[in-house]
């Protein structure tokens, strides 16, 4: 049995397009070998119509393409302007046509809405283009060609070959007379309006010998597709308006009262404030299709959405559109989680990211939403051990606590870290969460020295001062690497003297590195946690240098450098290419976990999520 798979039967009507996906095992050989679409002949051969190596048969010129998606193990054959002649038996396959790595597809194209009492029916979507074909006889070849629209009892001239254009059609209509060989003229109307619908009459000549042809134009207003999503979840609007508007500005708008449609986002850079931080307009394909992702759905997001194309970037009469009616289900399966997490400069935040607990093995991601252009979300860290260079030593993604929640810790905060962040996985696409990090006034709770230098072969002791509010928390030291933070042994040195108005419950916990080696160089974190839930962290960079004088080093706060400030981000970090999250497969279906416990008085990182989302803390 061939491992190739596809649709056994495809049925369509004249003038339509089909998109046939063929699936193959994505082995290295298969991914790179020739893909083809061929038509089976009566004698058993199969004549190639299109292949991945660039061949296109004259029968398919200008109306078909074949695209390989090696990462998915699929290739897609798109065929437009179908006619009944396209009906037949085909094969989609890999390699050589006769080799047998193929799948049989039956394509049946039936006659579309054809001639009814000599009236040609044209059914076209609002905003699209129609071509009305008008045949004539040789004796009228040199005579005036015209198109009339029947309004009430009277035909009204729309366009003629002498240059007249009815004002209602200005800028969106033309009359084409085919070459001398073809006895046909056509009228092309763009940006169709609902008011264009009706009976038309083509005419060649003006006397009793004139040729006439009736046409019935039906302009369809798109029925809204019903979309149901959960409160706090997300929705993706896929908008395919056709290649004829590939280079026209695109928009998504939400209908308010009457015919008004308020722009939510467009490709000209406009974005409604209510969607700040939770919307992405994914770049359009060559065919002009694009998608808009909205996360953190709210009750008030429900309504009718239109996507369209117009040079103004907003809905105008004649814009081609697609429509959706979004319903937001308030009995949501997605639990509440903080929408705002607050931290102080030099401090840290721990963000809990929910995901679908069925997808524990999925790759977890955290990205920073950027509002520039159409919105994008470059990756900062993932669960596979990748961390963006500028974040090394201060960002970690931990699989804990697990069972539907992972944790992201960001420390050495500066005002530049304020913004919107998205939690994602490579699993399902309907659940994603957004959290806003706000930087507020205040001092970090944990006190550590600034950057520290250790001497090869000696002992280094690094202190971390914990205020009394953390008395019930587990205190730890760990060494940061790009897959997490590996716990290290530490000593409780008793009460700390680093805090005013703090009783015996404050603590000084030291990290001791015995016989320092080059491998000890790097970032170290001290922090607090309760079980698998992480709270505040503080980071210290330990540099290692050659021995100068014997002895061990005991670093105190006084001797240490100042706490890192915003300049840290500028010091020699190598910019690497951003990985923007524009592939919908990177979005996750996730389950959020509410966290109402305060982060130990919350002077460093508290949570404020507004309205009904108010929470006590994001980290503990």
């Amino acid at each position: 049995k061939s491992p190739i798979f596809g649709p056994e039967e495809v049925n369509s009507v004249e003038g339509n397009s089909v998109s046939i996906t063929c699936y193959y095992p994505p082995t290295s050989v298969n991914r790179h070998t020739r893909k083809y679409w061929c038509r089976q002949g009566a004698r058993g051969g199969c004549i190639t119509l299109i292949s991945s190596e660039g061949y296109v048969s004259s029968k398919y010129a200008g109306r078909a393409n074949l695209t390989n998606f090696p990462e998915n193990g699929t290739f897609v054959v798109n065929i437009a302007q179908l006619s009944q002649d396209d009906s037949g038996r085909y094969k989609c396959g890999l390699g050589i046509n006769s080799r047998g790595l193929s799948f049989d597809v039956s394509l049946e194209v039936s006659q579309g809405p054809g001639l009814l009492n000599d009236t040609k029916v044209y059914t076209v979507d609002l905003g699209r283009t129609v071509t009305i074909n008008c045949p004539f006889k040789t004796e009228n070849a040199q005579k005036r060609k015209s198109l009339y629209k029947q309004i009430g009892l009277y035909p009204v001239l729309v366009i003629d070959s002498s240059g007249y254009v009815n004002p209602n059609y200005t800028g969106r209509i033309r009359l084409d007379i085919q070459g001398t060989g073809q006895l046909l003229f056509s009228v092309v109307i763009n940006q169709l309006r609902l008011s264009d619908a009706g009976q038309y009459l083509c005419q060649a000549g003006d006397d009793s010998n004139s040729n006439k042809k009736n046409a019935d134009l039906q302009v369809l207003k798109p029925e809204p597709e019903l979309v149901y999503e959960d409160l706090r979840g997300s929705v993706t609007f896929h908008c395919a308006l056709g290649p004829e508007v590939a280079n026209v500005a695109k928009f998504l708008c939400r209908q308010s009262s009457g015919e008004n449609c308020d722009v939510v986002v467009n490709t000209l850079g406009k974005r409604a404030p209510a969607f700040e931080g939770r919307i992405l307009l994914n770049p359009q394909d060559k065919d002009g299709s694009f998608s808009v992702v909205i996360t953190g759905l709210r009750k008030e997001d429900a309504g009718r959405y239109l996507c369209g194309a117009h040079s103004d970037g907003q809905l105008q009469e004649g814009s081609p559109i697609q429509a959706w009616q979004l319903f937001v289900n308030e009995e949501s399966t997605i639990p509440r989680s903080p929408t705002v997490v607050k931290g102080v400069a030099g401090g840290s935040v721990a963000v809990l990211c929910p995901y679908n607990r069925k997808e524990s093995k999925s790759i977890k991601y955290w990205c920073l939403w950027e509002g520039a252009q159409n919105g994008r979300c470059p990756l900062l860290v993932d669960s596979e051990g990748w961390v963006k260079a500028q974040y090394e030593g201060r960002l970690s993604l931990l699989e804990e606590p697990g069972n539907g929640t992972f944790t992201v810790i960001l420390n050495q905060l500066t005002s530049r870290d304020a913004g919107f962040y998205w939690c994602l996985t490579n699993g399902d696409t309907l659940w994603r969460t957004t959290v806003e990090i706000k930087i507020i006034e205040g001092e970090p709770n944990l006190k550590v020295p600034g950057n520290v230098t250790a001497v090869l072969g000696e002992t280094l002791k690094v202190p971390c001062h914990f205020p009394c509010k953390f008395s019930s928390y587990e205190k730890y030291w760990c060494k940061w690497n790009n897959t997490g933070c590996q716990a290290l042994p530490s000593q409780d040195e008793g009460p700390s003297k680093a805090f005013v108005n703090c009783d015996e419950n404050s603590r000084l916990v030291s990290l001791t590195l015995n016989l320092v080696t080059r491998a000890d160089e790097g970032w170290y974190w001290c922090g607090v946690k309760q079980g698998h839930f992480y709270g505040e962290t503080a980071a210290v960079y330990v540099a290692v240098e050659e021995r100068k004088a014997a002895g061990s080093r005991d670093v105190s706060l006084a001797k240490a450098d100042a706490a890192p400030d915003e300049k840290v981000l500028d010091s020699g970090f190598r910019e690497i290419e951003n990985k923007a999250i524009q592939d919908p497969r990177l979005f996750a279906e996730e389950k959020a976990v509410a966290d109402t416990r305060d982060q130990a008085d919350g002077s460093r990182a508290s949570v404020d999520s507004g309205s009904s989302e108010e929470q006590g803390g994001s980290s503990r």
Epitope: F5, P7, E9, N11, E71, T74, E225
Partner: nanobody
């Protein structure tokens, strides 16, 4: 809530025919694709057939083990799907599940993969006696 209700299952003799129906209802549900999977005792869920549509175009998919014997179709409204089972064999004995999808999936989604379907019916038992 969306509901898929299968009907038409029962006992049939080897070589005979059976027609299963699956009706989708609830939340003004309008799927983009519907399909059939089956599960025999102690075996994994197996793809049988699927039908996907976009405007006036329909795409029909059939599993290897039933090719040439089973056909899938739908009603004009697109809310009911049928599985016509001809020349049935004892190995066709299984619980037949209807599946539906309300989201037009990315081209990389393989209709044979049960994980890629949003909604499932409770199943109808088909027993083929020899």
């Amino acid at each position: 809530q969306v509901q898929l209700v299968e009907s038409g299952g029962g006992l049939v003799q080897t070589g005979g025919s059976l027609r299963l129906s699956c009706a989708a209802s609830g939340r003004t549900f309008s799927p983009y694709a519907m399909g059939w999977f089956r599960q025999a005792p102690g075996k994994e869920r197996e793809f049988v057939a699927a039908i996907r549509w976009s405007g006036a175009t329909t795409y029909k998919y059939v599993g290897d083990s039933v090719q040439g014997r089973f056909t899938i179709s739908r009603d004009a409204a697109g809310n009911t799907v049928y599985l016509q089972m001809n020349s049935v064999k004892p190995e066709d004995t299984a619980v037949y599940y209807c599946a539906a999808d309300r989201v037009p999936k990315d081209i990389s989604i393989d209709p044979r993969n049960p994980k890629d379907w949003d909604y499932w019916g409770k199943g109808t038992l088909v027993t083929v006696s020899s």
